[in-house]
């Protein structure tokens, strides 16, 4: 791929994007306080007007901007005031307020759930072949191996907390060391930031708004990334997590705690339950090599059933295989021996749809699969949309106040810190990193969460999820309380390492940089989203698997070489763009190179074609379908409901350009219907001051 | 009712064969192991070994190895004990025992018996 | 083999006295140990199995106990129809094994 998606000729012009440039945007005038960022990420020295005239950082011809892409929108208020309506109208607003929340709150449980059951259905595809994954005797000896077992497994079944729930198991019962199980639950941290990149491209249909979204959700994929990219190595060399952790469980006699309280799954769990429920012992029971468990449903048939312990009396092939001498005996062929067994016996069936249709565990998972990212597109779009008719004007510019400014100086420093603790808190509260995260990313799309603001929080998230699984390992059995505790605290420690990397000085917070770079591109060539989201989640892990699996040898053969391009790529980039002329003439950019290696261009040109729209026309039946298909085939502009879109960007033909960002009109609202989206609606009848 | 009915008494030659049989009746022929027990005169118990008919599986004293045979014949629900290279401490009286009671050793149906006479 | 070592090898009491028959194991067998009743002339009779279990029809006089290598038949009250040898016999491990046997009469 290429170094830079777009290396054509630069010309430095403030007033131009940088497409690739890991989000080093030209700085606009400040509009309004409230976008104002205190914990600026961006180093001086990469600002648009330092660049020389044959700088690389390529600057896309396009019609000028005068506004940050990742300034937030000014939602604007184009509703009655309240002051000015009578009591009629202030008694409609009041109840069109509370209907609103009462929509945002329905919305969000069915968002919640079909998270929940999207889990699920990977389970039921790929939780098979996950907990296969675990039983490979190479993850001993092999760190990297570890670590994409991790990943994949994650993405496969997504959770993490089954993910490492299985890999504690495996500690539990000596199938696994801790040294060996970090760089899995290292890659279930990787794993587990797919759920709300997924969420992500629900947002596709507003390109300024998926260019939030998106890096907002893949900040979690870069924070992940990195922190494993420099945390792995080191602990391969020191061993400093199994040591401190090793320490901590050492140094404490724990007693069995009580379970993490299940906040949010009390809410769920009785709707989740009636759709399907599994058996996850299964996957565990897979990984643990238990040959009767490949054969078994993970589709859950019998929820009441009654265990009886007995003793029966079994054929052993010889005496040395008794349970004990004095339980053996002949009855002059054989000898037999007592065997406690423990017969299970089903009482009464499991309460959900697929009960008692038998279908195999892909074909269900296939349907829910499919149902649970319709419910989650369909419930996104929807909290957007009320999220978008509330936050206007005065609700607004509280909101954003209150969660995007700093305090004041000199503790403008600790405003990210409290943010990570409101993040851990709130994930301990829903009990899932993938639900909290998931939540944010509509916030940052329609412009209520700056990705500066939003980073703090999904690092809060990345240790929220951990105290809930120190709180769920104090609650083991005695057996699984060391190892469980252990691996829990490697996770904490882990994170907590990754944050003390990527936060607390503002240059090092590469993945914010990173992440609105993505965006970028993302918002340009749309479908880039979903080539990052296959080539990061399952692509590269796989290859690494396979690799592996050949050996050793192979794996180096080819990782080095690979690992040694990108080195070179990232040197030739840094020099190019801090100090080009050390750089011969022709190094000093990437010209050099063919188009196709420089330039996503040919590549939105083949992917056009393959995708049959050539960016001309994007039918659809409804609106989720017309997002997954403006995200296939990159269509302009999101089309009307039933209705197809041919060639809806004339005036724009040629010009590579992000659509009209909302920003530029009155409010989202406005911006939508100008762009096609939703049909016009009398603006004098929104309500949006409570 | 559970019968075990064994052919007549035998007089061999030392270093000749018998053939003894067990003719069964009242219960399933093919459900029991049937073992085979022998008390020389004035004396104690000695077990000889077992068939289990269903399957033809047998165990043998090894005492007795390579000299007993136990074969079945689930046709006539009857079992066959075969003793070669007869000596004349083999003389006593063969009994046919089978073992209703499910997974042990203790035998709770006994033929008559057969005596077996080694005398030159 | 397992040995199973009978005693006393004969005993002569009166009716109605309490008769105690011992068997000892040369090894471990647990609780597979059955005892076994042969009247003059007759086949043997199978009176208890695993160690303390009387067959169908034996009087409630017949009484085993014990476990791993120490056995024990107990006739509470003897009668006259119980003269016969009393034999034991281990079924924990092939071949199985007899004990030499104990000849009960009535004075």
């Known amino acids: 791929m290429a170094p830079w998606p777009e290396l054509g000729d630069a010309q430095p012009n403030p007033d131009k994007y940088l497409e690739g440039a890991a989000g080093q945007q030209p700085t606009a005038p400040d509009k309004s306080k409230e976008t104002n960022k205190t914990d600026n990420t961006e180093a001086p020295v990469t600002k648009i007007e330092l660049l020389p005239s044959y700088s690389t950082a390529t600057l896309i011809d396009e019609p000028t901007e005068v506004d940050d892409p990742w300034n937030l929108p000014t939602l604007q208020d184009s509703g009655i005031k309240w002051s000015e309506r009578d009591t009629k109208g202030k008694i409609l607003c009041f109840f069109q307020g509370i209907g609103r929340l009462i929509l945002l709150l329905g919305f969000l449980y069915f968002f919640v759930c079909s998270l929940d059951i999207l889990s699920s259905a990977f389970q039921l595809v790929g939780g098979k072949m996950a907990g296969q994954f675990f039983s490979n005797s190479s993850i001993m000896s092999n760190p990297l191996l570890g670590l994409v077992i991790g990943v994949l497994v994650t993405v496969l079944v997504q959770s993490s907390s089954t993910s490492t729930s299985i890999v504690v198991s495996m500690v539990s019962s000596s199938l696994l060391t801790v040294r060996a199980a970090i760089p899995i639950i290292m890659g279930a941290n990787i794993g587990t930031s797919i759920t709300n990149t997924i969420v992500a491209l629900m947002q596709v249909g507003d390109r300024s708004e998926f260019r939030r979204a998106f890096a907002g959700a893949t900040v979690h994929d870069f924070f992940n990334w990195l922190s494993v990219l420099v945390l792995l190595p080191v602990e391969v060399a020191t061993h400093y997590l199994e040591i401190i952790t090793q320490l901590i469980v050492e140094s404490f006699h724990f007693k069995n705690g009580e379970d993490a309280p299940d906040l949010l799954k009390v809410i769920t769990k009785p709707f989740t339950k009636l759709i399907v429920q599994l058996d996850k012992k299964v996957i565990s029971q897979i990984a643990m090599n238990d040959e009767k468990a490949k054969n078994k449903s993970l589709v859950k048939i019998w929820c009441k059933t009654f265990t009886n312990k007995t003793q029966i009396n079994v054929t052993v092939p010889s005496t040395a295989n008794c349970t004990s001498p004095s339980l053996c005996w002949t009855d002059g062929i054989q000898n037999w021996t007592m065997k406690n067994v423990t017969y299970k016996e089903n009482i009464a069936k499991c309460q959900h749809i697929f009960v008692n249709f038998h279908l195999p565990d892909l074909a269900v998972g296939t349907i829910l699969l499919i149902l649970s990212l319709l419910v989650l597109c369909g419930c996104l779009i929807m909290i957007v949309k009320i999220l978008g008719s509330v936050l206007k004007g005065q609700v607004a510019t509280v909101i954003k106040k209150t969660i995007n400014t700093d305090f004041p100086f000199p503790f403008a420093w600790l405003t990210g810190y409290l943010a990570i603790l409101v993040g851990a808190g709130m994930t301990f509260i829903v009990q899932s990193s993938s639900v909290f995260t998931s939540a944010l990313t509509p916030l940052i799309g329609i412009g209520v969460i700056t990705i500066e603001r939003a980073y703090p929080l999904t690092l809060g998230s990345n240790i929220g999820t951990t105290t809930t699984a120190i709180l769920a390992a104090l609650a083991s059995p005695g057996n699984a309380l060391r190892s469980s505790l252990q691996i829990a605290l490697c996770h904490f420690f882990f994170n907590i390492s990754g944050i003390l990397l990527w936060y607390p000085i503002p240059f090092t917070r590469l993945p914010i940089r990173m992440a609105k770079g993505l965006g970028n591109i993302s918002a340009k060539y749309r479908w880039f989203a979903v080539f990052y989201l296959i080539i990061f989640f399952f692509l590269i892990p796989l290859t690494v698997f396979g690799l592996s699996l050949a050996g050793w040898r192979v794996l180096v053969g080819v990782g080095v070489p690979v690992v040694f391009i990108i080195i070179l790529v990232l040197c030739l980039r840094l020099l190019q763009s801090r100090c080009p002329r050390v750089l011969p003439k022709k190094l000093q950019n990437w010209n050099f190179l063919p188009l196709w290696m420089r330039s996503l261009k040919p590549w939105d040109a083949v992917v056009s074609k393959f995708t049959g729209c050539f960016q001309m026309r994007c039918c659809c039946c409804c609106r989720v379908c017309c997002r997954a298909c403006c995200l296939l085939c990159d269509c302009p502009k999101c089309c009307r409901c039933s209705k197809c879109c041919e060639d809806l960007e004339e005036a724009q033909e040629g010009q590579d350009v992000p659509v009209k960002a909302p920003e530029t009109f009155d409010n989202i609202t406005i911006s939508r219907e100008a762009q096609g989206e939703v049909p016009a609606s009398d603006s004098k009848t929104e309500c949006t001051a409570l | 009712q559970v019968q075990l009915v064994q052919s007549g008494a035998e007089v061999v030659k030392p270093g000749a064969s018998v053939k003894m049989s067990c003719k069964t009746s009242?219960?399933?022929?093919?459900?029991?192991?049937m073992h085979w027990v022998r008390q020389a005169p004035g004396q104690g118990l000695e077990w000889i070994g077992a068939?289990?008919?269903?399957?033809?599986?047998?165990s043998y004293n090894q005492k007795f190895k390579g000299r007993v045979t136990l074969t079945a014949d689930k046709s006539t629900s009857t079992a066959y004990m075969e003793l070669s290279s007869l000596r004349s401490e083999d003389t006593a009286v063969y009994y046919c025992s089978i073992s209703t009671i499910i997974t042990t050793g203790a035998v709770d149906y006994w033929g008559q018996g057969t005596l077996v006479t080694v005398s030159s | 083999d397992i040995v199973m070592t009978q005693s006393p090898s004969s005993l002569s009491t009166s009716v109605g006295d309490r008769v105690t028959i011992t068997c000892k194991a040369s090894q471990d067998v647990g609780t597979a140990v059955a005892w076994y009743q042969q009247k003059p002339g007759q086949s043997p009779k199978l009176l208890i199995y695993?160690?303390?279990t009387r067959h169908t029809g034996v009087p409630d006089r017949f009484t085993g106990s014990g476990s791993g290598t120490d056995f024990t038949l107990i006739i509470r009250s003897l009668q006259p129809e119980d003269v016969a040898t009393y034999f034991c016999q281990q079924y924990s491990r092939i071949p199985l094994t007899f004990g030499s046997g104990t000849k009960v009469e009535i004075k």
């Open positions: 695993w160690t303390s």
């Open positions: 068939i289990y008919p269903g399957s033809g599986d047998t």
């Open positions: 009242g219960y399933t022929f093919i459900t029991y192991n």
